[in-house]
């Protein structure tokens, strides 16, 4: 057989999300082999004939690659021999979403694992004080989201309060006609309070915090991918 000891190797994948228009990574690790030419990596996508990517004998073999992935894929070549079969995907498209299989063959055995790849758009929100309004208000903006997210406001002082009556949220389609800009305004804010603007869809959740005092404005934001 040419395989010592066993015929099945452990392959591990992680569900991940791609931000359309940016580069993404489909994560896959495996029990490493000690020699590069003993390793074959194949990435496949459910419903697609041909391969997403193939790496064998220390080189990419793109002879069977499906045209929708042409010029957009790469493995981390220097990491293959230590068990990293992750795939770099350039310029993520909405249509890249789906079920992928990471198939590995080494001189020790073979194995595969599936991963769900979600695609959408998500971005950090930025909150600013809107001094133009008749009463002091906060403006929360995030440039790229898809699918359309929900937006909610919260405050440290008024925990559990419903701010839907005193906020206004709008979604503006961006020029590529897929992603949208999110703008939400919260009215009648008080100083010496911390407000949070939370934007969430089925792919990501982003939170922007702002603390307004007499002397300064402090901001913080974070982004978390869901189910990954």
């Amino acid at each position: 057989f040419g395989i010592s000891g066993k015929h099945f190797i452990t392959v591990t994948t992680f569900t991940s999300a791609g931000n359309i228009g940016e580069d993404g990574t489909l994560s896959c690790t495996f029990e490493p082999d000690i020699k590069l030419n003993g390793i074959v990596i194949q990435w496949l996508k459910e419903g697609i004939k041909g391969l997403v990517h193939e790496f064998k004998e220390g080189k990419d073999d793109l002879s069977q690659q499906h045209e929708m992935f042409r010029g957009r894929t790469a493995v981390f070549a220097d990491q293959v021999v230590v068990g990293n079969a992750s795939l770099r995907l350039k310029n993520v498209q909405l249509t890249d979403a789906g079920t992928y299989t990471c198939y590995i063959r080494t001189s020790k055995g073979k194995g595969n694992a599936n991963l769900e790849y979600k695609t959408g758009a998500f971005s950090m929100p930025e909150i600013n004080v809107d001094y133009n309004a008749s009463s002091e208000s906060l403006r929360c903006e995030a440039p790229r989201w898809f699918p359309q997210p929900t937006v909610a406001w919260a405050s440290q002082v008024d925990q559990g309060a419903n701010f839907s009556e005193v906020s206004n949220t709008s979604f503006e389609l961006n020029s590529e006609n897929v992603t949208m800009k999110v703008v939400s305004v919260l009215y009648n804010v008080t100083i010496n309070n911390t407000y949070s603007c939370m934007i969430e869809n089925d792919i990501a959740k982003a939170t922007g915090d702002i603390k307004v005092t007499d002397s300064e404005v402090k901001r913080r934001s974070q982004l978390q991918l869901l189910n990954s």
């Epitope: 000891g5 490493p32 000690i34 590069l36 030419n37 220097d78 021999v81 230590v82």
Partner: antibody, heavy 117, light 107 residues
Framework: QVQLVQSGAEVKKPGASVKVSCKAS????????MHWVKQAPGQGLEWIAA????????DYNQKFKGKAKITAVTSTSTAYMELSSLRSEDTAVYYC??????????WGQGTMVTVSS | EIVLTQSPATLSLSPGERATLSCKAS??????VAWYQQKPGQAPRLLIS???YRYTGVPDRFSGSGSGTDFTLTISSLEPEDFAVYYC?????????FGGGTKVEIK
Amino acid sequence: QVQLVQSGAEVKKPGASVKVSCKASGYTFTSYWMHWVKQAPGQGLEWIAAIYPGNSDTDYNQKFKGKAKITAVTSTSTAYMELSSLRSEDTAVYYCTTTVAHYFDYWGQGTMVTVSS
Amino acid sequence: EIVLTQSPATLSLSPGERATLSCKASQDVSFAVAWYQQKPGQAPRLLISSASYRYTGVPDRFSGSGSGTDFTLTISSLEPEDFAVYYCQQHYNTPLTFGGGTKVEIK
């Protein structure tokens, strides 16, 4: 941080055996190959063998089959190499080295084995 | 067995000079070559992995290039601590093999 600590120098008579140990710390011992490399006095480096502690898979340089036997004990994160039927040409420094993020990125300090009658 | 031939065997240079070390493989090894530095009484130290990836903490005066059968390690401007023996090693196929080494000595 990753550390590989080898056992001390040994002096052996021809025909005897010696067992060199390599204790690993600072990483998941079972997830990475551990290799053994020989360096005779004033000479270059020679790969002996490797073991994957996660499933005890081994790979030997044909030249050292029958001479070296490598094992690993996962409970103590320790790799061992036993050299048998020692001869003067086995006199060398033996290194353990692992491949965590890159090839041979961490090395033990080396164990000098001297074979002398 | 893949044979790696390093040249020259010895390189006599002065601090500040450029060092170019060669490693030739007896067959195509793709990019699966690493370079190590060894000083007397010490274990080898990884400098370059996968032909051209500089390892963490390695000064940027060290660079690696090549693929297939011809590989080069370049030290752009030698520092006193760079005088040592340098080995190339292939992990394309087993048995894993090392070159015979190049000694970089002070002129």
